[in-house]
């Protein structure tokens, strides 16, 4: 009679994480008498997966009834597979012995590969806000996938980004992998409504990739532009001066009026108007009683936006006996003066 052979017909088996793996094994003979054991790996460090004779193996079930006398099918099923289960599994026949059974013959092994989905990508932006024209970095991370091959793309405003670096770790063989990517994005004044998207594509996802997003509204700071304007005289001795605060984001803004360097009034932006691009406009006005001033009045609109150093715009009211036409200050710099004669 021919000597018993242990046949593992599948050189490799590919299973999705969470599924059940079937590892096939048959013997060609009933002799010698003795149990079958399954191991992961070979050599002295091998891990026992199933022992026909004894032990408790809750995740393992046998395909056929091993208690039947003429059974030669020793296939097993391993439930709820995770990437940690990947490896080569050996079906090993033992010969009955005393006191211990003796290893008789091993199958050629079946390599179990586990396909695991990547986790949802998490996109994080810079810790501090940045202003338009600055370049900021966004990172994207996804973990726990197998096999190693994965595609990562970045998008912003309908376009694919090209300035990014991606690493998949570890470099060598592993049960599962992680991906880390850093993209560089140049901010523009129109980015309040923009999104940065990180997209991960993997064989396990097939029809739909996974995406993580970051809103640039959490990253961008658009500093305001200021314009101080003198309105026509409301009453004999009163001048209305307005400070237009335009195109700022986020909304957090405090405005202080100074008359000749002395604080006249401080207010916080509340009833702002929103522009189409997501930035805000706000207007504050100051009524100046000119008759109370003997000398020229320097009015300053000082704005502290989102905790940044204050920017200001000044306007000179010239207290004089000679009337002149009134106008407005439209100078673009942060501090500017525009003389006006008030009577």
């Amino acid at each position: 009679e021919e000597e018993l052979q242990v046949i593992q017909p599948d050189k490799s088996v590919l299973v999705a994480a969470g599924e059940t793996a079937t590892l096939r094994c048959t013997a060609t003979s009933l002799i010698p008498v003795g149990p079958i054991q399954w191991f992961r790996g070979a050599g002295p460090g091998r891990e026992l997966i199933y022992n026909q004779k004894e032990g408790h193996f809750p995740r393992v079930t046998t395909v056929s009834d091993l208690t039947k006398r003429n059974n030669m099918d020793f296939s097993i099923r391993i439930g709820n597979i995770t990437p940690a289960d990947a490896g080569t599994y050996y079906c090993v026949k033992f010969r009955k012995g005393s006191p211990d059974d003796v290893e008789f013959k091993s199958g050629a092994g079946t390599e179990l590969s586990v396909r695991a989905k990547p986790s949802a990508p998490v996109v994080s932006g810079p810790a501090a806000r940045a202003t338009p024209q600055h370049t900021v970095s966004f990172t994207c991370e996804s973990h726990g996938f197998s096999p190693r091959d994965i595609t990562l793309k970045w998008f912003k405003n309908g376009n694919e980004l090209s300035d990014f670096q991606t690493n998949v770790d570890p470099v060598g063989e592993s049960v599962s992998y992680s991906i880390h990517s850093t993209a560089k994005v140049v901010l523009t004044r129109e980015d309040v409504h923009s999104q940065v998207i990180c997209e991960v594509a993997h064989v396990t996802l097939q029809g739909d990739p996974l995406r993580g997003t970051a809103n640039l509204s959490e990253t961008i700071r658009v500093p305001p532009t200021l314009e101080v304007t003198q309105q026509p005289v409301r009453a004999e001795n009163q001048v209305n001066v307005t400070c237009q605060v335009r195109k700022f984001y986020p909304q957090r803004l405090q405005l202080t009026w100074l008359e000749n360097g002395n604080v006249s009034r401080t207010e916080t932006a509340s009833t702002v108007t929103e522009n189409k691009d997501g930035t805000y406009n706000w207007m504050s006005w100051l009524l100046v009683n000119v008759s109370a001033h003997r000398d020229d009045v320097k009015l300053t609109c000082q704005v502290e936006h989102d905790g940044q150093p204050a920017v200001s715009k000044s306007h000179d009211l010239k207290v004089s006996a000679h009337p002149k036409e009134q106008g407005s200050n439209t100078a673009a710099e942060n501090t500017g003066s525009n003389e006006r004669n008030i009577y």
Partner: antibody, heavy 120, light 107 residues
């Protein structure tokens, strides 16, 4: 070469069940999604959903939740569309289509279509 | 859901004409746009993916362009075999959505 071959035309009465098959060849079946698309007579294309051929997960478009089911017979590289309790408005041609992955989730290969007529 | 709008449902054209079919998405689809050709009684055939990439075997007279929300399929010189219905389809998000189709007919 890559081929998707669908089962033949079906004539059903309202309330019956229809099962359409789509046999794939020329590629590794479990590496690509399988989509299903409906085309009513004289109308445009309507995406019904897709089946992840590896994990078995199904995704259905809102209009196709309930009576519609996607099945697989992986060993035979075959996908199935089953419509339960068929109605007159299910009269259409149904297409299976392979979906790519990576950077291209497009439906690149299509079955020839299966005509389903529901009539009492 | 992303709506795909093909403004013209049909076009009367002459052989040799340059034909332009437009497709507008209700939101950014990041170039994840496909164009299909369908002849009566046949399955759709993929012509262009990724808004601009011509599939293998598709004649070079076909081209795709566009980005963001607006996309175009062009046929430089219409041939008899191009008479068909053309569909755009976005695959940026589920549910995948098709345009209503544009049917080319010979004058």
């Amino acid at each position: 070469q890559i081929q998707l071959v669908q089962s033949g035309p079906e004539l059903k009465k309202p309330g019956e069940t229809v099962k359409i098959s789509c046999k794939a060849s020329g590629y590794t079946f479990t590496d690509y999604a399988m989509h299903w698309v409906k085309q009513a007579p004289g109308k445009g294309l309507k995406w019904m959903g897709w089946k992840n051929t590896e994990t078995g997960e199904s995704t259905y478009a809102e209009d196709f939740k309930g009576r519609f089911a996607f099945f697989l017979e992986t060993s035979a590289s075959t996908a199935y569309l089953q419509i339960n309790n068929v109605k007159n408005e299910d009269t259409a041609t149904y297409f299976c289509a392979r979906g790519g992955y990576g950077s291209n989730y497009v439906m690149d290969y299509w079955g020839q279509g299966t005509s389903v007529i529901v009539s009492s | 859901d992303i709506q795909m709008t093909q403004s013209s449902s049909s076009f009367s054209v002459s052989l040799g004409d340059r034909v332009t079919i437009t497709c507008k998405a209700s939101e950014d689809i990041y170039n994840r746009l496909a164009w299909y050709q369908q002849k009566p009684g046949n399955a759709p055939r993929l012509l262009i993916s990724g808004a601009t990439s011509l599939e293998t075997g598709v004649p070079s007279r076909f081209s795709g362009s566009g980005s963001g929300k607006d996309y175009t399929l062009s046929i430089t010189s219409l041939q008899t075999e191009d008479v068909a219905t053309y569909y755009c389809q976005q695959y940026w998000n589920s549910p995948r959505t098709f345009g209503g189709g544009t049917k080319l007919e010979i004058k």
